[in-house]
């Protein structure tokens, strides 16, 4: 059962796993959620009745029954992990904590103009977990405006104390705001010989890389495959770090693979979600339960629905035994990974999908692309919405893209003459416009947020957000698309599609079926040559064939230019403007979404 509210002046008795320090009960709840075993927690707030050494302690707890006895205690705040909830979770914490000193290893000290600059420095430093900044009112003159970057083994402070005129906060790497290089390569036959901070068992290098990414101290990893000569090290995932943040020594070794933490590529890749099945593989761990199941998929479902289950092994039924049902072993361990991995015993193993909600929903697999043809099929572009106006009569106005459960990203120029959000309707999961009848459900629009520098499409800033009145429940036919990550700014996208119900030629009508066209990106330099009378800025991106023939057109505005990279779809552009439609040497011009990620996050995450 999902319980989100916090219990004031309440302490859970027993079940302690570990104690960490957090600046707030809210953040304690996040830490509990991300801990492999924590189901409940008790946080101690600052209080005159409480021993100051216990202030800001966050005690992480577990219980077989998923609850613990409650005791009244002043200044204690208790609650449950979000593991039991189905809503999306994020580790992103932008809060700044005033008059708190978060203790850790101070490894870098420099002068900064503001707390924001200090936080940016922390976000762009590979080792930094959190920071403390002495404001210009700090009593000690030589420490004023000093930005201390800090790290710890756990990623959380080792202690938190009250200190006047300082502020503290966390790195925003988990908010996808780091400018650090995103290094996606996995190197075969390679061992990184730097110091190990931890080791876990993993079925493949991809899982090892994902574990490294969400481990607070891991910067790169080495994985020994099941063919590794030393038997005791097979399937071993070594989590590593170095002072420079980069591997210092690379050794060529067969049957080993190495790679990097993807912390600065966050939101573009699944990090917590290990969705594959591993055949002829047994995961060992503490046994939680053994249940009958028809298939390994059913076993994974059972594991996902059991809040304490972390991974499973399914042994298929022997012929005609137990109504064709096999045995599903639900398992757990102290760190969420198997304690040992065995091969050749006929089991099928995998992980809970409960943690998938900690990844951005947009990274989950969708229907494979239908190659060829111009009409889309249902579920092919589940982020695409049709935006209707009801005034003077109801009609399709523009396209748009779902980027969050209450947010649509579209073009600012769509709202010329739109006086109020009340006349707008957003329809999702639609393939044919003819499906939209009077009784078709839609989302009302609560607010239209147009970029304040927008004047006209051709001069840029052609971007707008719609805040919906109600939240979108994600399904196969309506789900979000990922925003491009700033760490991926230099990716060259080669698989880009424009979609919409717009005209198929300049003088035409809105199409009934959602149309799609694969269109290559064009460099801004090339695009500028085609539009001598306009300034093509870096905040724009162009796409089109030199010979024309395929393009967005009237009615497609606001819709997505969707590009697939590393099996994940990204919203690279918003259909904005162009000269005519599909004309020779006149590419379409799109709003370059990566340049507006900060603006989008600022608007969608504003309290």
């Amino acid at each position: 059962e999902c319980v989100t509210q916090l219990l004031k002046d309440t302490c859970f008795e027993g079940g302690d796993i570990t104690t960490v320090f957090t600046p707030s009960a809210k953040y304690c709840q996040v830490v509990c959620t991300y801990h492999p075993r924590c189901l409940l927690f008790t946080f101690t707030a600052e209080s005159p009745s409480e021993d100051p050494t216990r202030w800001f302690t966050c005690v992480l707890k577990d219980s077989v029954t998923e609850t613990l006895p409650r005791v009244n205690r002043t200044a204690a705040i208790s609650g449950y992990s979000f593991k039991q909830c189905s809503h999306q979770i994020s580790a992103c914490n932008k809060d700044i904590y005033v008059d708190l000193d978060m203790k850790g290893i101070n490894y870098n000290s420099s002068v900064a103009k503001s707390a924001q600059e200090c936080q940016e420095r922390c976000t762009d430093d590979v080792h930094c977990h959190f920071f403390t900044y002495a404001t210009r009112q700090f009593p000690s003159l030589e420490h004023r405006n000093i930005c201390l970057l800090k790290h710890t083994q756990t990623g959380t402070p080792t202690r938190i104390t009250k200190l006047d005129k300082v502020v503290s906060g966390f790195s925003l790497k988990s908010c996808a705001l780091s400018n650090l290089a995103c290094i996606r390569d996995i190197f075969p036959n390679t061992v990184f010989a730097d110091s190990n901070i931890d080791s876990v068992m993993a079925p493949d290098a991809f899982v090892c890389g994902r574990i490294c990414t969400h481990h607070p101290g891991c910067l790169f990893f080495t994985f020994f495959s099941q063919e590794w000569p030393k038997e005791s090290q097979r399937n071993l995932c070594l989590l590593k770090t170095s002072e420079s943040g980069l591997p210092s020594t690379r050794i060529k070794k067969s049957k080993a693979l190495s790679g990097f933490s993807l912390q600065s590529c966050r939101h573009s890749i699944p990090v917590f979600c290990h969705s594959s099945f591993y055949h002829d593989t047994d995961f060992l761990g503490e046994e939680l339960d053994i249940v009958a199941a028809k298939s390994h998929e059913a076993c994974q479902k059972l594991c996902t629905n059991a809040v304490r289950c972390q991974f499973f092994t399914y042994t298929p039924a022997q012929a005609s035994c137990n109504e064709g049902k096999g045995k599903c072993y639900l398992k757990l361990s102290s760190n969420g990974s198997p304690t040992k991995i065995l091969h050749g015993r006929g089991g099928i193993s995998g992980y809970t999908l409960r943690l998938c909600k900690m990844d951005n929903e947009c990274t989950t697999k969708i229907k494979p692309r239908i190659v060829g043809g111009t009409a889309s099929v249902r579920g092919e572009w589940p982020w695409q919405v049709t935006l209707h106006t009801t005034s003077p009569t109801q009609r399709h106005l523009c396209g748009g893209s779902i980027i969050g459960n209450q947010w649509i990203l579209t073009a600012a120029h769509c709202f010329y003459g739109v006086e109020s959000p009340k006349i707008l309707r957003v329809y999702s999961g639609i393939l044919n416009q003819s499906e939209i009848k009077e009784d078709t459900s839609f989302f009302g629009v609560q607010e239209i947020i147009i970029h304040d520098q927008y004047k006209m499409a051709e001069s840029g800033y052609d971007i707008a957000l719609l805040k919906l009145e109600t939240t979108v429940n994600y399904t196969d036919s309506q789900r979000p698309i990922c925003l491009p990550s700033k760490g991926d700014r230099n990716v060259i996208y080669t698989d880009c599609w424009v979609t919409g119900w717009g005209y198929r030629k300049l003088r035409d009508k809105i199409q009934n079926t959602l149309q799609k066209a694969k269109i290559p990106l064009v460099t801004n330099e090339e695009c500028q040559k085609r539009y001598r009378g306009h300034k093509i800025t870096h905040k724009m991106i162009c796409a089109g064939y030199r010979e024309g023939g395929k393009d967005a057109c009237k009615g497609d505005s606001g819709g997505p230019l969707s590009c697939k990279h590393n099996e994940v779809w990204h919203l690279v552009g918003i259909t904005s403007w162009g000269e005519g439609c599909a004309q020779r040497e006149r590419p379409g011009v799109y709003t370059n979404v990566v340049e507006y990620v900060d603006w989008i996050l600022e608007k969608t995450q504003a309290v």
Epitope: S244, G245, L246
Partner: nanobody, 124 residues
Framework: QVQLVESGGGSVQAGGSLRLSCAAS????????VGWFRQAPGKGLEGVSA????????YYADSVKGRFTISQDNSKNTVYLQMNSLRAEDTAVYYC?????????????????WGQGTLVTVSS
């Protein structure tokens, strides 16, 4: 003693090409980030391109994407910047820099070692 030496600068007509080289001694490009930066007259330092030599991951400023290509020759401990379709606004002193940490690739503040620079002049 670390030394980075740039070469290959010069004067060229708009639309022309140049290839800059950066050779290192006392510092190995392998396992490190190497960046090209430029400073136009009266302007600040601007990140142009960078490479992480271990896997060859490359990074480019939007203003040069599609025109400039960064590459490496680990055996010669040299990094190259191939500049095509040059424009007047590419006129600047080009610097090669080496980082010893994981960095935001186009942020000059995080690079440790710097060359003396080579002048590129593009006339229209």
């Amino acid at each position: 003693q670390v030394q980075l030496v740039e070469s290959g600068g010069g004067s060229v007509q708009a639309g022309g090409s140049l290839r800059l080289s950066c050779a290192a001694s006392g510092y190995t490009f392998n396992n490190n980030f190497v960046g090209w930066f430029r400073q136009a007259p009266g302007k600040g330092l601007e990140g142009v391109s960078a490479i992480y030599s271990l896997g060859g991951s490359t990074y480019y400023a939007d203003s040069v994407k599609g025109r400039f290509t960064i590459s490496q020759d680990n055996s010669k401990n040299t990094v190259y910047l191939q500049m095509n379709s040059l424009r007047a606004e590419d006129t600047a002193v080009y610097y090669c820099a080496g980082a010893i940490t994981w960095v935001p690739p186009l942020s000059h503040r995080r690079y440790t070692y710097w060359g003396q620079g080579t002048l590129v002049t593009v006339s229209s």
